[in-house]
Amino acid sequence: LTCLGGFASPGPVPPSTALRELIEELVNITQNQKAPLCNGSMVWSINLTAGMYCAALESLINVSGCSAIEKTQRMLSGFCPHKVSAGQFSSLHVRDTKIEVAQFVKDLLLHLKKLFREGQFN
C-alpha cells in the first residue's frame, strides 16, 4: 500500500482518493485479522467488472453482526448509494460460488489495487 502514497499530491483531491481510502480499509481488515474474519461467514462471489462496488456491497451486506466489515460496507455505499435495479444486480453475482468473507476481502483488495495502479478510479 505504501506505493499508493506516490499518487497523492497537493491541490485538488484526485479521484483516486476514495478508492485509496477503501483500499486502506481493506488492508486494515486483512492485517488485523486474528480469528476467522466474521466467524468464517460465507458470501457470494462476484464479477470483478463493471458494477462491482454495488455487487460487493450486496454480497457483504448479507454478513450480519460483524463490526470488522461495517466501515467497508458503508464506504462501498459511497460508490453505490441508491439501489440498482433487480435486472442490473442479477448479472453482478456469480450465484453458484460462495467464499469466505476473508477470501472475498482479499480478492476485492487485489482487484482494487490493480485498478488503482491502472488509474481506473471510477
Partner: antibody, heavy 118, light 111 residues
Framework: EVKLVESGGGLVKPGGSLKLSCAAS????????MSWVRQTPEKRLEWVAS???????YYPDSVKGRFTISRDNARNILYLQMSSLRSEDTAMYYC????????????WGQGTLVAVSA | DIVLTQSPASLAVSLGQRATISCKAS??????????MHWYQQKPGQSPKLLIY???NLESGIPARFSGSGSRTDFTLTINPVEADDVATYYC?????????FGGGTKLEIK
C-alpha cells in the same frame, strides 16, 4: 466528530435561484455519498438529492431539472444549486451524510432555511 | 411513490413505560430479504438523528432502549422504557425505491 454546517439559505422570489453550501468535517468526505433533505413548514421530511463519492447524482421528479447537487472534494463542501424556485420549495434544508440505501442518512447538519415568497 | 403511514400521529406515555410507533408502507420495502426501512428521532429545535437502520439494526451510540422490528410493509419502533429525554418526533424512511420517502412523523410526549 462528524460536523455538517449548512449556509446560503434566505428569502427568494418565485422563479429565483439560490445556492446552498454544506461544509463537512470529521470524516473522509470523498469516501461517502452525500444528500440534501428538506423539512417543510408542516414538518414533513422530503429527500431532495444525493451524490455518490464518484459524482453520480440522484433526484426525485419534483426537483429534477431545477436543482443540481455537486461536491468539491478538495474543500469538503457539498452544494445544492436551486433554480426556478416555487413556493412549495420553502423549507429547512438539511445536508446529510448518506451511508447508502442499507444504512440511511447517518449524520445531519443543523439546516438552513429557504423561503420562497413574492 | 411508496407512501409511509405512521400511527399514531402523537402519543403520550408515562416515564418507564413502553412506547410503540407503527409505520406501514404502501408496498414492500424489502430487498433480497433485507428491509430498507430506517427510523429517525428529531428533538424540538434540532435536526433528525438516525436511530435504527434496516428495520432492526441499532445505530452506533443509540441506547438499547430503542428497538425496531418488522418486514415488507409493516414496521414498528419501540422505546422501552421511555425516558424524559425521548420527547421528540419520530420518522420512518424507506430507501428501497426512488424517490426515497418518509413517514409523516409521530410526536412522543410524556404523560
Amino acid at each position: 466528530e462528524v460536523k455538517l454546517v449548512e449556509s446560503g439559505g434566505g428569502l427568494v422570489k418565485p422563479g429565483g435561484s439560490l445556492k446552498l453550501s454544506c461544509a463537512a468535517s470529521g470524516f473522509t468526505f470523498i469516501s461517502y455519498a452525500m444528500s440534501w433533505v428538506r423539512q417543510t413548514p408542516e414538518k414533513r421530511l422530503e429527500w431532495v438529492a444525493s451524490i455518490s463519492s464518484g459524482g453520480n447524482t440522484y433526484y426525485p421528479d419534483s426537483v429534477k431539472g431545477r436543482f443540481t447537487i455537486s461536491r468539491d472534494n478538495a474543500r469538503n463542501i457539498l452544494y445544492l444549486q436551486m433554480s426556478s424556485l416555487r413556493s412549495e420549495d420553502t423549507a429547512m434544508y438539511y445536508c446529510a451524510r448518506l451511508d447508502g440505501y442499507y444504512f440511511g442518512f447517518a449524520y445531519w447538519g443543523q439546516g438552513t432555511l429557504v423561503a420562497v415568497s413574492a | 411513490d411508496i407512501v409511509l403511514t405512521q400511527s399514531p400521529a402523537s402519543l403520550a406515555v408515562s416515564l418507564g413505560q413502553r412506547a410503540t410507533i407503527s409505520c406501514k408502507a404502501s408496498e414492500s420495502v424489502d430487498n433480497y430479504g433485507k428491509s430498507l426501512m430506517h427510523w429517525y428521532q428529531q428533538k424540538p429545535g434540532q435536526s433528525p438523528k438516525l436511530l435504527i437502520y434496516r428495520a432492526s439494526n441499532l445505530e452506533s451510540g443509540i441506547p438499547a432502549r430503542f428497538s425496531g422490528s418488522g418486514s415488507r410493509t409493516d414496521f414498528t419502533l419501540t422505546i422501552n422504557p421511555v425516558e424524559a429525554d425521548d420527547v421528540a418526533t419520530y420518522y420512518c424512511q424507506q430507501s428501497n425505491e426512488d424517490p426515497w420517502t418518509f413517514g409523516g412523523g409521530t410526536k412522543l410526549e410524556i404523560k
